[in-house]
């Protein structure tokens, strides 16, 4: 799976919030960033996070399409040189400073399985998608694609106009 | 290459019902979404409906809802919509198209080249 | 739903002539919305992706650009085979395809 150029297609700020809509939150805690899940305030603001969208070539052994299985990587960034990352060995998702480019446990591929929702699968281990987990993000292991409508790795995407990043 | 080829259109009576099919091949048709578009003679072009790669999830406007129906077969790489209570505002081209991406519902990549169905008494 | 309003219905031009089609959405889809070319008796085609990329195999003088509720088809310099209709299309909260434009030789 490689991407097939080293600009984003396309990207934007969204605020990110799980199917049952609590929202995805980011806290610097002794020079490190944390991740939450957790219901917010009436009026409490949503941090944003920056989609970096990539397009993807899927290796044609594996498809059969040739050079026509594309498919979308995305890159995660709640704040600037921070990106989420994939830890593939302690099922994790963590918040790590990175420089680019960027390294393989940095970008996710994306899916939709319901039209207003999508679901983020690790690029360096397929079949593991970013899910909640104890009110925090982690791995979650998907063994068939039934269950790629489990609601716990479906994510809401609140889209803003803005395209500058905090 | 990845083809497309729709079938089943023809004339129906008010009220009548129809099946298309659309046959897939060149690509790993399970890993996208599919679409059914149409355009009535000399009229712009219609989305009809959607279907997720699992065929967990269809969508339609309400100008089919409730009368149309997608599915899809992944074992036989088919795609399908079956249109029941027809109209004589449904006559138009259908096509089958498929998803630019694997597993996500944008874009248009390919499309067929359509199955004509007229709705007539 | 999502209304998607394009124009002009319809224009005249020559080859060489620079063209400008816009397409205009009832609410934010960001930049999820497509181009599509048609010729008559022919399929759809995709010309841009993502409101500013070029499908692969299309000429360069073709371009796209906007975001939330504002987008332009852009065709640099026509050529004789650009003489179609076009149409915009957003996926950004169900699908929606604009009215279209058909370009004529003037």
């Known amino acids: 799976m490689s991407i097939t150029g080293i600009s984003p297609i396309t990207e934007y700020l969204a605020s990110l919030s799980t199917y049952n809509d609590q929202s995805i939150t980011f806290a610097l805690e002794d020079e490190s960033y944390e991740i939450y899940v957790e219901d917010l305030k009436k009026d409490e603001k949503k941090d944003k996070v920056l989609l970096s969208y990539y397009e993807s070539q899927h290796p044609s052994n594996e498809s059969g399409d040739g050079v026509d299985g594309k498919m979308l990587m995305v890159t995660l960034s709640p704040t600037k040189d921070f990106w989420l990352h994939a830890n593939n060995k302690e099922h994790s998702v963590e918040l790590h400073k990175s420089e680019k480019p960027l390294p393989d446990q940095a970008f996710f591929v994306l899916h939709n399985m319901h039209s207003n929702s999508v679901s983020f699968e690790s690029k360096t281990d397929p079949g593991v998608f970013i899910g909640v987990k104890d009110n925090h993000l982690a791995l979650i292991k998907v063994d068939s694609s039934e269950n790629l409508s489990t609601e716990n790795i479906l994510f809401k995407l609140s889209e803003t106009h803005h395209h500058h990043h905090h | 290459e990845v083809q497309l080829v729709e079938s089943g259109g023809g004339l129906v009576q008010p009220g009548g019902s129809l099946r298309l099919s659309c046959a897939a091949s060149g690509f790993t048709f399970s890993s996208y979404w599919m679409y059914w578009v149409r355009q009535a003679p000399g009229k712009g072009l219609e989305w009809v409906a959607s279907?997720?790669?699992?065929?967990?999830?269809?969508y339609y406007p309400d100008s089919v809802k409730g009368r149309f129906t997608i599915s899809r077969d992944n074992a036989k790489n088919s795609l399908y919509l079956q249109m029941n209570s027809l109209r004589a505002e449904d006559t138009a081209v259908y096509y089958c198209a498929r998803g630019h991406y694997y597993y996500t519902s944008y874009s248009l990549g390919y499309w067929g080249q359509g199955t004509l169905v007229t709705v007539s008494s | 739903d999502i209304q998607m309003t394009q124009s002009p219905s319809s224009l005249s031009a020559s080859v060489g002539d620079r063209v400008t089609i816009t397409c205009k959405a009832s609410?934010?889809?960001?930049?999820?919305l497509d181009w599509y070319q048609q010729k008559p008796g022919k399929a759809p085609k995709l010309l841009i992706y993502f409101t500013n990329n070029l499908q692969t195999g299309v000429p360069s003088r073709f371009s796209g650009s906007g975001s939330g509720t504002d987008f332009t088809l852009t065709i640099s310099s026509l050529q004789p085979e650009d003489f179609a209709t076009y149409y915009c299309?957003?996926?950004?909260?169900?699908?929606?395809f604009g009215g279209g434009t058909k370009v004529e030789i003037k």
């Open positions: 279907i997720t790669p699992n065929a967990g999830e269809d």
């Open positions: 609410q934010n889809i960001n930049k999820h």
């Open positions: 299309f957003q996926y950004n909260n169900g699908w929606t």
